[in-house]
């Protein structure tokens, strides 16, 4: 059974992941990003189901495409450090989903834009956090 300290650690890691995903989304939405239109043409795979930490496998598998899109989006008005940012996110995802069990991700038939993709995983984090608190 999860201890209160492990639950707290999980909550903090989810909050970390949530904040990093929100930072990317805010950057895409709120700044004069000349490459936004092009960014929205890239398609991301969405999880068929995302209700448990093991489902983060589906996010992990899409982190490389996310890094590539963020690299393409770099401009004077949209500056992130995609390699470091995705590396930070990857570390948290690996810790959260664990490596004990191998989970095969199932994807939905419909693909999504980067905005829809980020919103989906932000909602996932918020949902899990709410069950922990």
């Amino acid at each position: 059974a999860p201890t209160s300290s492990s639950t707290k650690k999980t909550q903090l890691q989810l909050e970390h992941l949530l904040l990093d995903l929100q930072m990317i989304l805010n950057g895409i939405n709120n700044y004069k990003n000349p490459k936004l239109t092009r960014m929205l043409t890239f398609k991301f795979y969405m999880p068929k189901k995302a209700t448990e930490l093991k489902h983060l496998q589906c996010l992990e598998e899409e982190l490389k495409p996310l890094e590539e899109v963020l690299n393409l989006a770099q401009s004077k008005n949209f500056h992130l450090r995609p390699r470091d940012l995705i590396s930070n996110i990857n570390v948290i995802v690996l810790e959260l989903k664990g490596s004990e069990t191998t989970f095969m991700c199932e994807y939905a038939d419909e693909t999504a834009t980067i905005v829809e993709f980020l919103n989906r995983w932000i909602t996932f984090c918020q949902s899990i956090i709410s069950t922990l608190t």
């Epitope: 909050e15 970390h16 990093d20 930072m23 950057g27 004077k76 008005n77 450090r81 930070n88 996110i89």
Partner: antibody, heavy 121, light 110 residues
Framework: QLQLQESGPGLVKPSQTLSLTCTVS??????????WSWIRQHPGKGLEWIGY???????YWNPSLKSRVTISVDTSKNQFSLKLSSVTAADTAVYYC?????????????WGRGTLVTVSS | NFMLTQPHSVSESPGKTVTISCTRS????????VQWYQQRPGSSPTTVIY?????PSGVPDRFSGSIDSSSNSASLTISGLKTEDEADYYC?????????FGGGTKLTVL
């Protein structure tokens, strides 16, 4: 008005770990939109970026210092900290903390007053 | 990685105009914003120009920044020089991996 203040020991022995804290007042580290940075200036020399942290805890470092640098954040105290391991005399410098925008580009404003750290036995 | 090269020192008389250059060694100067910081002796740096040509509130309009893609350099121009402008000036830019400062230029107001 946002203010930053560095604090920590002014003298560190070679091979030990340098530890500094930056206390932010007049604004919240958790408000988002900014990274929290460390920069240093060797005596009589130019400026060198060390790294920065987002309030989520995500770190970004100068590639040349990455292996020795740890930056952490304590949102409850409105502070962020720098640890630099295995220091040598070459790490003697004035260390500054500063605020950096997250998406519109890496620049620094405002800066703390700076604290001189000397590495000597 | 790229470097930013500035003249070691410049000097000019009060009331005159001075320009400090900052040349990027590789990659386009226009690809990322350039900032300029003023550092008076014994003080921490303060921003005089950010995002190529923007002035923070409180910085007089005697200070201006520009970018020249043909020479791959940025410039800080100070007009109507005053003795209080005597300081070290640093340019700064970045890429997706690093933040880079110029070596600094000592401005002497004669």
């Amino acid at each position: 008005q946002l203010q930053l203040q560095e604090s920590g020991p002014g003298l560190v022995k070679p091979s030990q770990t340098l530890s500094l804290t930056c206390t932010v007042s007049g604004g919240s580290i958790s408000s988002g939109g900014y990274y929290w940075s460390w920069i240093r200036q060797h005596p009589g020399k130019g400026l060198e970026w060390i790294g920065y942290i987002y309030y989520s805890g995500s770190n970004y470092w100068n590639p040349s210092l990455k292996s020795r640098v740890t930056i952490s954040v304590d949102t409850s105290k409105n502070q962020f900290s720098l640890k630099l391991s295995s220091v040598t005399a070459a790490d003697t410098a004035v260390y500054y903390c500063a605020r950096t925008p997250t998406v519109t580009g890496d620049w620094f404003d405002p800066w703390g007053r700076g604290t001189l750290v000397t590495v000597s036995s | 990685n790229f470097m930013l090269t500035q003249p070691h020192s410049v000097s000019e008389s009060p009331g005159k105009t001075v320009t400090i250059s900052c040349t990027r060694s590789s990659g386009s100067i226009a690809s990322n914003y350039v900032q300029w910081y003023q550092q008076r002796p014994g003080s921490s740096p303060t921003t005089v120009i950010y995002e190529d040509n923007q002035r923070p509130s409180g910085v007089p309009d005697r200070f201006s920044g520009s970018i020249d893609s043909s020479s791959n350099s940025a410039s800080l121009t100070i007009s109507g020089l005053k003795t209080e402008d005597e300081a070290d000036y640093y340019c700064q830019s970045y890429d997706t991996r690093d933040v880079v400062f110029g070596g600094g230029t000592k401005l002497t107001v004669l």
